[in-house]
Interface confidence: low
């Protein structure tokens, strides 16, 4: 492969916003490879060498009064300006989450399992995901992937609940997000529909069989008792 | 007090590759970058271009200054080259996977430098290029880089995927594998037993019950026909 030595210069002009644009901090940062060597910080008001490598630049740039004035004004002319231009599609961007709940492993009931609450495609990243079992919040056994940035202005996160699902239990994943006016909830019941229908079929069939058997025996023996004294002797039907 | 939002205009220039990048970042997401070859602004989401504009020529001027600064710093550092930092690679999907439901595989390449990387998607071991897309090199707070590669796909049990990453910090290409993990249906043993037993007992009960009902009714009818002696 290509084994030639590499040399990298990075520059980062940063605008940090607090409480909208009420407080703004501007940083002008220069890097050689990953090492920052000189910076302008609006909280300081002049360039400072971060390492010895940046001392010549700090001295030279601080001697240029026009440049310093320009950098001192950057919180307004650059930061607040760009914030205003981009605000409607960045700061105000809201995309609501898609929420799906499923068991991580397909285990039978009463076996240790991991219930997954998959929250996808939302923006911004601030999100609150909670697990509830039969209406009670579950705080232990909750594991999260943390916030995952998809790189396309959406986020996703998986929040898992370690549990032993029991028949009839209702698990609820509750999501709160700036795009939602009220929390979004998705339920998972501790019995699959096929399992439920099998149980119903079995129990239903059993009960129906017992009813028929009971009715049959009742009718048969009632008639046996009711006519026993009236039967003519010697003849069998 | 933690800031609410951060906007970063990030630039780099790399020698001897003579590659440069100019991009704007909002809270870790790219707003746009400038295509140096085409000299045009490329918005990360098409809709952004309807809200704002950026003159690409300004970025080219900045990159020229970055190049000049790099040459000064290279000499000043006594030609100290960069130390390669190999990437961490993760493959994930855009949303929960369902068979034959369109989805997107995301290959997340993180914590590396210098910003040069070769990424290939493999389906069943063969390179795939249809529909693939990627981001530019995205800045990190530790001044290393991140990058995303995307592959739209239709999940199936037959196909396996790999994201192959080559970087100077790696001794050999790094492959991250992904395949559809088909959930096996629950055994439902108890339910099956209850269902089978219940239906069997039910059926037997219905048959025997019906026989008894018929016999009982016949007996009743016979007795009524004969009447008392």
């Amino acid at each position: 492969g290509d084994t030639r030595p590499r040399f990298l210069e990075q520059v980062k002009h940063e605008c940090h916003f607090f409480n909208g644009t009420e407080r703004v901090r501007f940083l002008d940062r220069y890097f050689y490879h990953q090492e920052e060597y000189v910076r302008f910080d609006s909280d300081v008001g002049e360039y400072r060498a971060v390492t010895e490598l940046g001392r010549p630049d700090a001295e030279y740039w601080n001697s240029q009064k026009d440049l310093l004035e320009q950098k001192r004004a950057a919180v307004d002319t650059y930061c607040r300006h760009n914030y205003g231009v981009g605000e409607s599609f960045t700061v105000q961007r809201r995309v609501y989450p898609e929420v799906t709940v499923y068991p991580a492993k397909t285990q039978p009931l009463q076996h240790h399992n991991l219930l997954v609450c998959s929250v996808n495609g939302f923006y911004p990243g601030s999100i609150e995901v909670r697990w509830f079992r039969n209406g009670q919040e579950e705080k232990t056994g909750v594991v999260s992937t943390g916030l995952i940035q998809n790189g396309d202005w959406t986020f996703q996160t998986l929040v898992m609940l370690e549990t032993v699902p029991r028949s009839g239990e209702v698990y609820t994943c509750q999501v709160e997000h700036p795009s939602l006016t009220s929390p979004l909830t998705v339920e998972w019941r501790a019995r699959s529909e096929s399992a439920q229908s099998k149980m119903l079929s079995g129990v239903g069939g059993f009960v129906l069989g017992l009813l028929f058997l009971g009715a049959g025996l009742f009718i048969y023996f009632r008639n046996q008792k009711g006519h026993s004294g009236l039967q003519p002797t010697g003849f069998l039907s | 007090i933690k800031e609410e939002h951060v906007i970063i205009q990030a630039e780099f220039y790399l020698n001897p590759d003579q590659s440069g990048e100019f991009m704007f970042d909002f809270d870790g997401d790219e707003i746009f970058h400038v295509d140096m070859a085409k000299k045009e602004t490329v918005w990360r989401l098409e809709e952004f271009g309807r809200f704002a504009s950026f003159e690409a020529q300004g970025a080219l001027a900045n990159i020229a200054v970055d190049k000049a600064n790099l040459e000064i710093m290279t000499k000043r550092s006594n030609y100290t080259p960069i130390t390669n930092v190999p990437p961490e690679v993760t493959v994930l999907t855009n949303s929960p996977v369902e068979l034959r439901e369109p989805n997107v595989l995301i290959c997340f390449i993180d914590k590396f430098t210098p910003p040069v990387v070769n990424v290939t998607w493999l389906r069943n071991g063969k390179p795939v290029t249809t529909g693939v897309s990627e981001t530019v090199f995205l800045p990190r707070e530790d001044h290393l880089f991140r990058k995303f590669h995307y592959l739209p796909f239709l999940p199936s049990t037959e196909d396996v995927y790999d994201c192959r990453v080559e970087h100077w910090g790696l001794d050999e290409p790094l492959l991250k594998h992904w395949e559809f993990d088909a959930p096996s249906p629950l055994p439902e043993t108890t339910e099956n037993v209850v269902c089978a037993l219940g239906l069997t007992v039910g059926l037997v009960g219905i048959i025997i019950g019906t026989i008894f009902i018929i016999k009982g009714v016949r007996k009743s009818n016979a007795a009524e026909r004969r009447g008392p002696l």
């Epitope: 599609f89 105000q92 799906t100 709940v101 979004l184 | 809709e47 369902e98």
Partner: antibody, heavy 118, light 108 residues
Framework: QVQLVESGGGLVQPGGSLRLSCAAS????????MSWVRQAPGKGLEWVSA????????YYADSVKGRFTISRDNSKNTLYLQMNSLRAEDTAVYYC???????????WGQGTLVTVSS | DIVLTQSPATLSLSPGERATLSCRAS???????LAWYQQKPGQAPRLLIY???SRATGVPARFSGSGSGTDFTLTISSLEPEDFAVYYC?????????FGQGTKVEIK
Amino acid sequence: QVQLVESGGGLVQPGGSLRLSCAASGFTFSSYAMSWVRQAPGKGLEWVSAISGSGGSTYYADSVKGRFTISRDNSKNTLYLQMNSLRAEDTAVYYCARGYGRYSPDLWGQGTLVTVSS
Amino acid sequence: DIVLTQSPATLSLSPGERATLSCRASQSVSSSYLAWYQQKPGQAPRLLIYGASSRATGVPARFSGSGSGTDFTLTISSLEPEDFAVYYCQQYSNLPFTFGQGTKVEIK
């Protein structure tokens, strides 16, 4: 052809229940989010509820939350709206609509009229 | 909730004239998630524009959408007799999704 057909509308007393169905044909039903939108007589459109393609995510307007339940059966290509505790203000034509992108309906049924009156 | 206000409530124009319908949001809406619909009496709504400016399949070129942030516009460059109807805008950016109250385009 590509179409949506609603059914299940009718006259119901306040506090009563009704289940609307929407049969889809001519497209891969499971690939699309679906919505219910209603229109009170002589009034504008009001979004009621939406459900993702897999049925994993459901969304409701505040006015129906807790009373209405949206669901789908992808094997039957059918969308449902279970409406409980109906009120007079729920009287409307209910449209079933196919989502486009993030639920912008691009295909609509002809609607089914629900009248809540004593 | 995001409130969409359409203006004017009624627009009286003649065939061949240009119609400009406005839709204003109470807060910023991502333009990817704004749609326009046409509804004629006794019929279901029909999607005209999605993503603020993309024409839906089969929609004539005389219909165009524009705008961003809080202000969106539907323009019918030259009204045809079949264009007289009620037009609604809808945002599907934030839950709950909301519609404007509608603009009726009637024959003058």
